[in-house]
Interface confidence: low
């Protein structure tokens, strides 16, 4: 049986503190009591705490802990969220400029191709944007589609302007001939390599940033259990029950409690370290053909070179295509 | 040679930006992000200590609370007594990660594998099979502006890359981030309960 409190002992200090937590004083004893019903702040002697106060302390301790955790991750979370948004927007701007550069190249060098070329270029860069954002599109198909669409227009407008615009049958034949005859040389393959490598890296970079946000969000919103709440209460609030209002927890004791409460979170550490180092490795490799900014902004030049290649070989190509697609042409002329 | 599309319906503001020498490139912004992220490399292992340092803990006081009683800060009791019958640290360490942590760890493992797969060895400009097919890297040395495309008339140098970040309406100095002081900011009297 604990000794009775001295006659002049009151719970006045404890009451004034607890009132800030819970307005209304009915839960705080007037004078220290045995506290035999307490489950967390087990008394060694008379106590100024009641069971209800303990419950309030536990809830408050858990809320404090959740807020400390969120406060701890705030700067990191802000860093990744803001950068993910910046890079996503920057990549979209790159794509927009690359499209504008390519359209401008057509308008300056090949005005007769512009209406259709703009359409094909627009579709290509829309696919590029979708791919970066995670869409299930094949980059080689995108590039092939661009050149498949461009060649009939180049053939009918630049190489053989006499053909009627509505030569749909010959268009299909020309699309097939484009690949069979390697009309654009190795330029489509070059573009495929550069675009696919640079976009893959860009896409994984954005995915990695978004996963970073998910990791922080997961650990940021963990709810602490009743047992953890009891530990925290014992550490932060049980001293008040003894009227020790100004005393603070011992540092080593705090570390042990926190390691217990956060054992799960700390498991992530090894993989988080690896994540940052792997991301660094990726970023270090994002140059030249692994840098979408570099690749996409120079695409107009490579496409221009590919059209020049067609023009240089126009004579030979026209003859070959004349034979290949003769049937289609005859039907058109009738 | 391709007519450099500078004076045609391209956003004039952007082209001006493209020739400012002192703005950051996307690649420098990426490197800057990595440097900042690296300062958080020990974030998870340091969390317990961080939280203790940002909640009331006896630092300069002679006496401190160990969960049961007031003790001297450097005594054996400071870390031990209050912990009796409360939990078994050894048991904690023996337990594997729980499913919800495992789930996020699995996602991290997966992305780490992808990142490593995608990380390219330095110094390669083009794939070997492309080099063999006659697309050489031309005169573009490591310290020059980047080159794109084949050699010949079509070669064009993209000068120093676009300086997008002048155009982006973000200011990413983390010093301006909300709550950068990393102190818990009580939302209401329910939570503002540390008595210092």
């Amino acid at each position: 049986q604990p000794p009775p409190p001295p006659p002049d002992a009151t719970c006045h200090q404890v009451r004034s503190f607890f009132q800030r937590l819970q307005p209304g004083l009915k839960w705080v004893p007037e004078t220290p009591v045995p506290g035999s019903d307490l489950q967390v702040c087990l008394p060694k002697g008379p106590t100024c705490c009641s069971r209800k106060m303990e419950e309030k302390y536990q809830l408050t301790a858990r809320l404090n802990m959740e807020q400390l955790l969120q406060s701890a991750s705030m700067e990191l979370k802000f860093l990744i969220i803001q950068n993910a948004a910046v890079f996503q927007e920057a990549f979209e701007i790159v794509v927009r400029h690359a499209k504008n550069y390519t359209n401008a190249m057509f308008k300056n060098n090949y005005p007769s191709l512009t209406p259709q070329a703009f359409e094909f270029v627009g579709e290509f860069f829309t696919d590029v944007s979708l791919y970066i954002l995670g869409s299930d599109i094949n980059v080689d198909d995108m590039v092939n589609e661009l050149f498949d669409s461009l060649f009939p227009v180049i053939y009918t407008q630049l190489m053989n302007p006499g053909l009627p615009d509505s030569a749909l049958d010959i268009n299909e034949c020309l699309r097939g001939a484009r690949r069979d005859l390697k009309v654009f040389g190795n330029f489509p393959k070059l573009i495929m390599t550069q675009v696919s490598k640079s976009l893959q890296v860009t896409r994984i970079f954005l995915q990695a940033l978004n996963l970073g946000i998910e990791v922080i969000n997961t650990t940021d919103h963990l709810k602490f259990s009743k047992d953890c709440g009891r530990m925290l209460t014992r550490m932060w609030y049980c001293s008040y029950c003894q009227g020790l209002m100004m005393v603070k927890p011992c540092g080593g004791y705090c570390n042990v409690v926190m390691q217990g409460c956060m054992a799960g979170v700390v498991e992530i550490d090894k993989y988080w370290r690896e994540y940052i180092l792997s991301l660094e490795e990726l970023v270090n490799g994002m140059y030249r053909i692994y840098d979408m900014e570099n690749v996409l902004l120079g695409l107009f030049s490579t496409i221009h070179d590919s059209i020049q290649y067609v023009q240089k070989n126009a004579g030979k190509l026209t003859t070959t295509i004349g034979k290949l697609c003769a049937h289609s042409q005859q039907r058109q002329y009738r | 040679s391709a007519y450099y599309p500078e004076d045609l319906f391209i956003d004039k503001k952007v082209l001006k930006v493209a020739h400012v020498e002192h703005e950051e490139t996307l690649s420098s912004r990426r490197r800057e992000l990595i440097q900042k992220l690296k300062s958080f490399i020990s974030f998870y292992s340091a969390l317990p200590g961080y939280i203790c340092s940002h909640s009331p803990v006896a630092e300069n006081d002679t006496l401190c609370w160990n969960g049961q009683e007031l003790v001297e800060r450097y005594s054996q009791k400071a870390a031990r007594n209050g912990m009796k019958n409360q939990f078994n640290l050894h048991e904690l360490k023996m337990k594997g990660p729980e499913p919800v942590v495992s789930q996020i760890i699995d996602k991290l493992k997966h992305i780490n594998q992808l990142l490593r797969t995608m990380s390219m060895p330095k110094g390669r400009v083009l794939d070997k099979n492309l080099d063999e097919e006659g697309f050489e890297s031309g005169d573009c040395g490591d310290d020059e502006d980047e080159c794109i495309g084949g050699s010949g008339d079509g070669m064009i140098k993209v000068k120093n890359q676009l300086r997008f970040l002048a155009e982006l309406a973000y200011d990413l100095d983390v010093d301006d981030a909300p709550g950068n002081s990393q102190q818990a900011t009580p939302k209401d009297n329910e939570i503002s309960t540390f008595h210092n």
Epitope: E55, K223, F224, S225, K226, G260, A263, V265 | E98
Partner: antibody, heavy 126, light 106 residues
């Protein structure tokens, strides 16, 4: 296959007692908290009680506190609900459910109840 | 005791999209959703606000904002006719359920 099978329901007079059992199989029983949830005829679900994996933590809804006792025998993979001082308003289908909660140290992640039994009917009537 | 409030009933034609709201979750814990087919035990449908256990079609999705949550069902099918309950935890981590919503497929 993860399964929960309740038993022990029946007709009982007001003031009487019943003991419900729930046999678990297909998962590590002691690793999960377990709950009892009831559903009065034509009404919604009401949480009654739950118990931690080890059995040392028990929690009750205000409506049953002091009358019902939850317990578990991990060696038999069985959950129990001892119901005393039964009232007409305790008439319901009683389900046992596995808590989808993950624990690490003292950190819990609460994700609802992912496995339910088929239910056992308790009728309190004179 | 905390209370979660749901509309008593909602209805929609096959192929339509319906949403069921759940308000009053002030403890900050996630909201989970259950489906109870007539005469059957409840089944976990969405956990942690928007995660589907395996076997639950992606037509079902959840969302959370502040003290309210909602369950959305797209491409409504006849077999979706059931009672739907939201569930969370109060500040003492005791489970609390919403009153339930009867979904009728017209």
């Amino acid at each position: 296959e993860v399964q929960l099978v309740e038993s022990g329901g029946g007709l009982v007079q007001p003031g009487g007692s019943l003991r419900l059992s729930c046999a678990a199989s297909g998962f590590t029983f002691e690793g999960y908290a377990m709950s009892w949830v009831r559903q009065a005829p034509g009404k919604g679900l009401e949480w009654v009680s739950n118990v931690s994996g080890s059995g040392d933590g028990t929690y009750y809804a205000d409506s049953v506190k002091g009358r019902f006792t939850i317990s578990r025998d991990n060696s038999k993979n069985t959950l129990y609900l001892q119901m005393n001082s039964l009232r007409a308003e305790d008439t319901a289908v009683y389900y046992c459910a596995k808590e989808y909660d993950y624990k690490t140290g003292w950190m819990h992640y609460y994700y609802g109840m992912d496995v339910w039994g088929q239910g056992t009917t308790v009728t309190v009537s004179s | 005791q905390s209370v979660l409030t749901q509309p008593p009933s909602v209805s929609g034609a096959p192929g339509q999209r319906v949403t069921i709201s759940c308000t009053g979750s002030s403890s900050g814990y996630d909201v989970h959703w259950y489906q109870q087919l007539p005469g059957r035990a409840p089944k976990l449908l969405i956990y942690g606000s928007n995660n589907r256990p395996s076997g639950v079609p992606d037509r079902f999705s959840g969302s959370n904002s502040g003290t309210s949550a909602s369950l959305a069902i797209t491409g409504l099918q006849a077999e979706d006719e059931a009672d739907y309950y939201c569930q969370s935890y109060d500040s003492s981590l005791n489970a609390i359920f919403g009153g339930g919503t009867k979904l009728t497929v017209l």
